[in-house]
C-alpha cells in the first residue's frame, strides 16, 4: 500500500424499531472472535436488504457498536453480544462509532478488519484554524481597498 489511510471517527445514537424480520444486520467481534487486531469490539459485518437497519439508512458495514440500550459491549463473548441484540426489545438504541476514510497521499485501501483511525478533532482543529486565518486575511485585504 502506498501512502497512509486515516479515518475520521464520529459517534452517533441510532434508534431502530425492530421490523418483521428483526433488526437486519450481522455482527463480528467479541473477546473470543477478534475481528480487529487488539480490539474485541463488536462490528457490523452485513446490512440485510430491506431490513430495519437498511431502511433506516444510518448504520453501515464496518461501524463499531459501542452499546445497546445503554449497555456497554466491551469484553463480551461473541454469542453473548448476539444474544444481547436478540433480547433488546422492540425499540433498540445503538451507540455507534462510524469511521470515514480520509486519504493521505497516494492510493490506499481499507483492509479487511482494519479500522484503525484518528479522532475527528485532530482534523477539525487545523481546518478551523486555517479558516480563521483566511477570514482574518480577507478582512485585512478588504480594509486596504
Amino acid at each position: 500500500m502506498n501512502g497512509r489511510v486515516d479515518y475520521l471517527v464520529t459517534e452517533e445514537e441510532i434508534n431502530l424499531t425492530r421490523g418483521p424480520s428483526g433488526l437486519g444486520f450481522n455482527i463480528v467481534g467479541g473477546t473470543d472472535q477478534q475481528y480487529v487486531s487488539n480490539d474485541s469490539g463488536i462490528y457490523v459485518s452485513r446490512i440485510k436488504e430491506n431490513g430495519a437497519a437498511a431502511l433506516d439508512g444510518r448504520l453501515q458495514e464496518g461501524d463499531k457498536i459501542l452499546s445497546v440500550n445503554g449497555q456497554d459491549l466491551k469484553n463480551l463473548l461473541h454469542q453473548d453480544a448476539v444474544d444481547l441484540f436478540r433480547n433488546a426489545g422492540y425499540a433498540v438504541s445503538l451507540r455507534v462509532q462510524h469511521r470515514l476514510q480520509v486519504q493521505n497521499g497516494p492510493i490506499g485501501h481499507r483492509g479487511e478488519g482494519d479500522p484503525s483511525g484518528i479522532p475527528i478533532f485532530m482534523v477539525l482543529v487545523p481546518v478551523f484554524a486555517l479558516t480563521m486565518v483566511a477570514a482574518w486575511a480577507f478582512m485585512r485585504y478588504r480594509q486596504q481597498l
Epitope: L23, N26, D32, V44, R46, K48, Q79, V82, G113
Partner: nanobody
Framework: DVQLVESGGGLVQAGGSLRLSCAAS????????LGWFRQAPGKEREFVAA????????YYADSVKGRFTISRNNAKNTVYLQMNSLKPEDTAVYYC?????????????????????WGQGTQVTVS
C-alpha cells in the same frame, strides 16, 4: 470479496461415502457462517447443513441427519461435508455458501438469503 471453491464431488455407489471441501478466501474466515446447499435437476435449491463461526453449533436438514456431518478448519479456511450412507436421492450439485458474521436476528440456516457468497458447485452422483 469472498470466494468459495468446492471440491470432492464425484460418482459413488449407493451406501458409499464422499467428503466435500469448500476452500474460502479472506483473512477473517473464522467469522464466517457457512452452509451447504444442493440442487438436483429440475428441483429447487435445498438446504443440507450449516455451521456457525466457531464450529460449536451445527444445523442439518432432516433428510441428511445422522448421515452427513459438517465441520470446519479455521486454520485452513475450509469447511467440509462428510457424506456417508449415500442414497440415489442425494444426487445433486452441492454448493457452499457463506456470510460474514452472525445475524442479530433469529437465524434460519436454510434460507438462502442468509448468505452473501456462493461457490460454483460440485457434482455428486449416487448410482
Amino acid at each position: 470479496d469472498v470466494q468459495l471453491v468446492e471440491s470432492g464431488g464425484g460418482l459413488v455407489q449407493a451406501g458409499g461415502s464422499l467428503r466435500l471441501s469448500c476452500a474460502a478466501s479472506g483473512r477473517t474466515f473464522s467469522t464466517y457462517t457457512l452452509g451447504w446447499f444442493r440442487q438436483a435437476p429440475g428441483k429447487e435449491r435445498e438446504f443440507v447443513a450449516a455451521i456457525n463461526w466457531s464450529g460449536g453449533t451445527t444445523y442439518y436438514a432432516d433428510s441428511v441427519k445422522g448421515r452427513f456431518t459438517i465441520s470446519r478448519n479455521n486454520a485452513k479456511n475450509t469447511v467440509y461435508l462428510q457424506m456417508n450412507s449415500l442414497k440415489p436421492e442425494d444426487t445433486a450439485v452441492y454448493y457452499c455458501a457463506a456470510v460474514i458474521g452472525s445475524t442479530v436476528d433469529s437465524y434460519d440456516p436454510g434460507d438462502p438469503l442468509e448468505y452473501d457468497y456462493w461457490g460454483q458447485g460440485t457434482q455428486v452422483t449416487v448410482s
